[in-house]
Structure formats: C-alpha cells, structure tokens
C-alpha cells in the first residue's frame, strides 16, 4: 500500500516571494500543494483542510489560521475556522471560498491543502433488511479469549448500544461530526440511522453472532443517517481517539473504519500517525469493484485493508459492483450475508453485506489476537493475520486480469491457538505501485518501519524491465524496480519479514567481464543470504550461454547474467539459517515455481537466468513464482529454460525462545 500513489488531482501552486504583509515568509523555493478528490460527485468545495508542516505547534497553527482570516477579510472574503487540529496532524479546517486557495498556500508552515470530500459506509442493504435469528448453534464457536483486554473504536453511524446483542459492550462517546442528510424530504428514522453501526458492533463483539465476544467498544459518530460522512469529520474523530489515548492510556487499541472515500492524502497521513502511535487500524477496502488504492483510508499502507468474500470464498458481488481488490488490500474476510444485530428491534438480527462487514471480522480477530498477546506490534499483528489466513482459496478469475497477481489470495481466519506462533519467521510480500511506462521510470516497494526487507524482485507484463536493486532510503532499505525502453512499466516486489535484532546489508557485484556471469556472496562472518536481485543498464539482456550455475558448496552466493549487477541481501540475526532451493525446467514454461518446506519461510525469490523473456519473479505465500513470456512468442527453446530460485530461512533463536516460554 503506497501512500503517495493515489489517483487524485494535485494542483501545485508555487509560492511567490512577494506575498503581501507576511511576517514570516516561507523558506525559499518550497511549494505547498493543493489536493482534491478525483471523484467529482464526492468533492465538498468550500471546506478545506490546511495541513501544516510536521513540527508546527498548536500556537503556530492558530496564528496561521488567524492570519488567513485577516488576509481574506482584507480582500473582502468571509472565512470560518471550523477546527484546529493538533495531536495527530498540525493544521486547521476552514470554510472559505476557493478563490483564497492561492493565498492560503503561501502562508507560513503550510505543507499542503486538501479540499474536503465525502466518505461512505461500505455495506448493503440499507433498506432491504431481513430479520433473522442467528443461523448456527452458539456453542459451535467458543473462542479461547474473547478480546477482553482490547478496546475497539468504531467510527460509523449512531448505534443502538442497548441492543441485546451488544448491551454493555459499547460505550457511546459524545463524539459526533456528520454532514446534513441530503434531500429536503429526508425522514430521520432512528432505526435506519443506527443500522450500519449497530450491525458492525454486533459483528465485532456481539454476544451470539460476534467474533470477539469479550471486546469492549467505543463508538464515534462520523456517518449520518444516510451512511455518509466527510474526510474532515473522520480526521477529527481520529484526533479524538489519539487525545483519549493520551489522556487515559489503556491496553491495545483497534480502530475500525468501515467507510471509504476517494484517495485522500490527509486521511492517509492521519492514519499513519495514529498507527505509529501504536494503534491498529482496520478498514474496508471499498465496495466499488475497483483498485482499493484509489480510495481512502484503504490506500494507507499502515492500515489493515480488508476485502470481502462469501461463504464459498469467492469475491463478493454487490449489485453491479463488488469488493475492491489490488495491492492495497491486505486480506479478505467474510462479507456477504453476515448476520448481526439489527437496529429494528432490541432482539432483531439482520443480514448485511460489504467490505465493512469484512473489516469488522478482521477487527474482531485482531482484538482476540491482541488480547492473547497484548505486546504485539502492528507489523507483528499484520504478519500473523496473513500467516493464519486460508491461502489460495479465492477464485482470482473474478478480478481484472491485471490485478490478479497484485491481489492477495488470503481469507482471514482465527489462529488455531491464540498463542504459540512466536517461533515462526513471518514474511509477507509487498507490491509497489506501477512505475508507469517512461524509459527511466522506477517503482519502489517499502516494508513497514519494524520489518526487514530481506529480498527484492521485479515484474513486468511486457518483460521489458531492467531488473531491481535494494537501496537505502531514509535509513531503511527499499526495493526499486527499473522499467526499460518500450516497456509498459514495472512493479517492485519487496519481501518484508519480522526478524528481531537483525543486521542486514546489501553486497553488490558489478557486471562481470568474463562470460561466466556475475556472482556475489555474503562474506561477513555469521551473515546468511536472504535474497538475490539483479539490475542491468542494457535495454535487452540477451541469452547467456552457458547457463549460469551456482557452484556446489557455495549456498551463500547470488549468481546472474554477466551484463547485470548482482545484489545479495545478507543478514545476521540470532539463530538465522537459510538455504537455497532451485527448480529448473529445461523446456519453455510460462510459470515455474518452487516452495519452501514446512517450518521454513520464503525470504527470497528470483529467476535464473535474468534474460529478457523472463517477466519477473515474486513470492506468493511460501512459494517463489517465476513468470516467463508466452512460450509461443519466445522462439528458441534454450532461451525458454528458466530456473526459479527460492531462499528459505528459519530462525532457531525464535524457536528456542518460544519453547522456553511454553
């Protein structure tokens, strides 16, 4: 999930130095930017979130807001400061004419300005509710720990908190920030106003149809009776949670955001800040049968984004639309005909569908995992959710062809036991945004702050790419893939793992002069090879004969085409051991795979040789997949021979630590 790659409009207005009457002129050459929702009907012009630079204090925010009002007044414009943000993001919410944007962008401390926009509940139906009792025996599902140590915040509609299914489990906070309902004849029927939130609270923690029966919840009203809210209202809600957390620190917090709007830089930024404050955020991927990266908060990398599947583990269709998909989705969960509390009466149940329901399932699972292991970090929780998911059960044909490889084939499941997974080396695959087709275009995939990048690969549908490399960026390794001339673009694929006390570095060998190919190995004592990457400057990497072979007895070595530079990811961590596993097919094949055995985790995935007919390599769960161009177009058979190279690791240290705990 890449924060910076949404499909949104950015209007960059350069700051001019001759700004009238500014006491504090902005630093020379800085540019504040203006953003607005790409989906026109969802825009709310006239209300703007002015985001200030990170270190800005509350007093400076207030001063900047007053300055804007004064300067607007001199021009004959009325403005109203609706809210001053602090605690999550510095800034303010202002009601003003769009004519003032240029002026506002020149104010000191301004980082960017975003026009407010709508967000929506992600469930159907709103009006076709079927009252039904829970359709299973309650004693079939008795979880070992119901999430009792965890508080789940729900940002949604109002809720009927004394419904029999959730009474005493939900504390309704006094937070409310919702837009007026649309339409002059809208009739506010209480049970409909409460419908979405009541159902979701029941899915998370309901006595009889809930996932985490012991979890306590707090509700914030950010969606109106039509299930509609605003980005600004959601931001103020997230800020409220952060302030509550600071005033009265409790145990682990899960925030459920069962809503979606267009891509929003500011909403994603707020989610990032809250996540970095130790809060687990779970959100709906969206019900638009579209790329989740085009929506917020679904596109925020720090948020756990959930798509919806049905009882047959197929993606949910919702009318003409359906669940969102793509690389910004972390996993799927049940989201069709989900039974939960109905606000129609205090004992009623109803079936609703959508990615909101799917997200509520995952919020419940997260609450149970955190209750069993309260010290879990967000990265550890996400990795566990992925690890315990059902793999490869979704029929990918439902997704658009170009999204299938990017969309995780994972359906959330409760761990068989809430304890005892600590010994596992957890890894996940993170895809970058598409690079775009220009000759020098690159794509970058990043791991979460407390994950280690153990390997880096690349993929291009056209096969025209110039490989990939791991490089340092802001003190952390990232995975960068390079497009080639005439290529339609590339993806970078990072393998991100939880490896405590790891010390990793990248060793590079430039292209070899000799015909034997390029090699690089981990020469530092105690360092093991976790991944191999190769990158080349030539436009078309020809077939390299004889085929590149790894010399026997040298497992800690990456080998590649003589015209490519080879990068070895070498890591030292207590008890870490790795081995190379290869699977070569002499005849041309569109896909070659190699998997790690039980107890070993795939950390690296690459292809040999790196010739131009190889589209790329990527990890799917514990399997390394190498894709080649359609065999009918490749010509010679010798060029078609491809080897998939997997690096499989395990941590004896983690295993021992786990045994000592038991």
């Amino acid at each position: 999930q890449e924060d910076e790659d949404g499909d949104y409009e950015e209007l960059v207005l350069a700051l001019r130095s001759e700004e009238d009457g500014l006491a504090e002129a902005p630093e020379h050459g800085t540019t504040a930017t203006f953003h607005r929702c790409a989906k026109d009907p969802w825009r709310l012009p006239g209300t703007y979130v002015v985001v200030l630079k990170e270190e800005t204090h509350l007093s400076q925010s207030e001063r900047t807001a007053r300055r804007l009002q004064a300067q607007a007044a001199r021009r004959g414009y009325l403005t109203k400061i609706l809210h001053v943000f602090h605690g999550l993001l510095p800034g303010f919410l202002v009601k003003m004419s769009g004519d003032l944007l240029e002026l506002a962008l020149k104010l000191p401390h301004v980082d960017y300005i975003e026009e407010d926009s709508s967000v929506f509940a992600q469930s159907i139906p709103w009006n076709l509710e079927r009252i039904t009792p829970p359709r299973y025996r309650a004693d079939e599902y008795q979880p070992p720990d119901g999430g009792s140590l965890v508080e789940v915040y729900l940002l949604d509609t109002s809720i009927q908190s004394d419904h029999r299914e959730i009474e005493g489990r939900v504390m309704v906070t006094d937070f409310e920030n919702v837009p007026e309902e649309d339409g002059t004849r809208f009739h506010r029927q209480a049970s409909k106003c409460d419908s979405h939130g009541t159902h979701l609270a029941g899915v998370v923690s309901g006595r009889d149809a809930g996932v985490a029966k012991g979890a306590s919840m707090r509700s914030l009203r950010v969606l109106n009776c039509q299930g509609k809210g605003t980005v600004s209202g959601t931001l103020i809600g997230l800020e409220f949670i952060r302030k509550s957390q600071l005033v009265q620190p409790v145990g682990p917090l899960v925030v459920l955001l069962p809503l979606a709007g267009g891509y929003s830089r500011v909403l994603n930024a707020a989610c990032q800040r809250l996540a970095r404050a130790g809060v687990v955020l779970v959100t709906a991927a969206g019900n638009f049968r579209d790329d989740a990266c085009l929506y917020s908060p679904a596109s925020a990398p720090e948020v756990i984004t959930v798509g919806a599947t049905n009882a047959q583990d197929q993606p949910v269709t919702l009318g003409t639309l359906g669940t969102n998909f793509g690389r910004c989705v972390d996993l799927f969960a049940p989201g069709e005909d989900i039974i939960g509390a109905s606000s129609d009466c205090s004992t009623c149940f109803v079936s609703q569908s959508g990615t909101s329901q799917a997200a509520a399932h995952v919020a419940g699972i997260a609450a149970m995992m955190l209750s069993a292991e309260p010290e879990l970090t967000l990265a550890e929780l996400r990795q566990r959710l992925i690890h315990f998911s059902a793999k490869d059960v979704i029929n990918e044909a439902w997704f658009p062809e170009d999204q299938r490889v990017l969309t995780p084939n994972l359906v959330a499941a409760l761990p068989p036991s809430t304890h005892g997974a600590g010994w596992q080396l957890f890894c996940r695959t993170v895809w970058s945004a598409h690079s775009g087709p220009t000759r020098m275009a690159t794509a970058v995939a990043r791991c979460a702050p407390d994950e280690e990048l153990l390997s880096c690969s690349s993929f291009s549908r056209s096969g025209k790419r110039r490989g990939e490399r791991m490089e340092a960026q802001g003190g952390k390794l990232v995975c960068r893939a390079h497009n080639a001339f005439g290529g339609e673009g590339v993806y970078a694929i990072a393998r991100c793992c939880l490896l405590p006390q790891a010390n990793c570095s990248v060793h590079t060998a430039p292209p070899a002069e000799a015909s034997m190919g390029t090699r690089v190995h981990c020469h530092q004592q105690g360092h093991v090879l976790t991944g191999c990457s190769s990158h080349w400057e030539v436009e078309d990497l020809g077939t390299h004969k004889p085929p590149v072979l790894r010399p026997r007895g040298q497992p800690n070595q990456c080998v590649g085409h003589r015209e490519a530079s080879i990068h070895a990811s070498c890591c030292h961590a207590p008890g870490l051991e790795c081995k190379v596993k290869e699977h070569g097919i002499p005849a041309p094949q569109e896909q070659v795979t190699v998997a790690c055995e039980e107890g070993w985790t795939l950390t690296g995935c690459s292809a040999l040789p790196g010739t131009s007919h190889v589209l790329g390599a990527y990890a799917v769960d514990n399997t390394c997949v190498v894709r080649s161009r359609d065999v009918s177009t490749t010509g010679s058979t010798s060029e078609g021979a491809v080897t998939a190279v997997a690096i499989c690791c395990r941590s004896r240290h983690l295993a021992q630590a786990s045994q000592e705990l038991q």
Epitope: A138, D139, D162, R164, E167, G168, V172, R207, K213
Partner: antibody, heavy 115, light 109 residues
C-alpha cells in the same frame, strides 16, 4: 456505584393500575435498557419486558402484552412500568434490572392486589 | 410451567461440590451464549453469579462455575459453604424474550 432504586410498596384493588418507578445511576444509561421481572410469593422469576433507555423502544412478554406500558424519563434517569387491569395473581414483588443481562437489580417493589 | 427445567432442590455438605442443571431447547439454552445464573436469598433481590454460560462477574467467588452442553446448562458450586444456601435460577435468551428456570433450592446440610 451502579444502582437501581425502586419506588415503595403499593396496595391496589382488582381492575386498578399500578405504576412502579426505577431510578438508575452510576453508569452510561444509553448502554443498557431496563428489564422488569416479577416474582409471585413463593414462586419463580417471570420476565415481563424491557425498555430501551436509548430510544424508548419496548419488548414486552406475551403474557402481559396489552396490559403493560414501560416508559422512560431521560431527564431524571427514571424508568416506569405501569400494569393495568390488575388481578389478584398480579400480586408479586416487581424488580427492575439492568439490561437483558440483568447484572444489577433494584431492591424490589411489593404490589399487592386485593379487594 | 417454566420454560427451563431445573431440579426443585439439591443438597450437599460443607466442602462438597454440587451441580444444578438447567434444561431448555435449541431455541433458548442451545441456541444462545447468554445463559445466566442468579442466587436469591429470602427477602432479597436476585444476584447475578454467572453470565454468558461461564463468566463470573467481579466479586463472585471462583467456587461458582458455569458450563453448557447442547441444550443443558449447569452451575457447579465447589467447596460448599453455609452462606451458599439459597434459591438458584437460570435464565436464557429466546429469539425475542428472556426465560427463567423454575428455581432450585440449595440446602447446605
């Protein structure tokens, strides 16, 4: 602390009505409704119904449906249970209890129906 | 006629364990996680001892435990004490209401 305080004992004639009050304190009122339960002398407990403190919605037991009305006054955090057309077999101790879970109970109100 | 069936009485000596059963149907006890147990001393309101089948409210002795199998719920009191002598009632959700058992008189010999 969480408390439910009920009104005092009542003696009524058959055919009359009785209105028992229950004042709640010490918890967020809208998070729970109030259940009413009665107990005839030497008998077991009988659930009469429930009222939402959040929106005033009610759920009455079939046996008393049509004779019972439950109401709330949110300004005073008080819930009322009125039973009409009293019969001698309505003689009982009437309890209010918090929510469907009935984790906190009032002290009880004795209603005697006698001619 | 109560919807849930309890034994009219049980007895035990101090220090012993006793179990009270509460039998319903798949429409009440068997269909919901919300079986509760109440203790009532003469002239007093009932007191919640167990909720949601097996959970103890804070302040209730861990000598009291609850379980459920199919359509029957059970309350077990271990290490019987004189003050445990009382009436015990079970309750359960039904699809639209609540239902109680007829009550069990526990005598500590």
């Amino acid at each position: 602390q969480v408390q439910l305080v009920q009104s005092g004992a009542e003696v009524k004639k058959p055919g009359a009505s009785v209105k028992v009050s229950c004042k709640a304190s010490g918890y967020p009122l809208t998070s729970y409704g109030i259940s009413w339960v009665r107990q005839a002398p030497g008998q077991g407990l009988e659930w009469m119904g429930w009222i939402s403190a959040y929106n005033g919605n009610t759920n009455y037991a079939q046996k008393v449906q049509g004779r019972v009305t439950m109401t709330t006054d949110t300004s005073t955090s008080t819930v009322y249970m009125e039973l009409r057309s009293l019969r001698s077999d309505d003689t009982a101790v009437y309890y209010c209890a918090r929510g469907y879970g009935m984790d906190v109970w009032g002290q009880g109100t004795t209603v005697t129906v006698s001619s | 006629q109560s919807a849930l069936t309890q034994p009219a009485s049980v007895s035990g000596s101090p220090g012993q364990s006793i179990t009270i059963s509460c039998t319903g149907t798949s429409s009440d006890v068997g269909g919901y996680n919300s079986v509760s147990w109440y203790q009532q001393h003469p002239g007093k309101p009932p007191k919640l001892m167990i909720y949601e089948v097996s959970n103890r409210p804070s302040g209730v002795s861990n000598r009291f435990s609850g379980s459920k199998s199919g359509n029957t719920a059970s309350l077990t009191i271990s290490g019987l004490q004189a003050e445990d002598e009382a009436d015990y009632f079970c309750s359960s959700y039904t699809s639209t209401s609540m239902v109680f058992g007829g009550g069990t008189k526990l005598t500590v010999l």
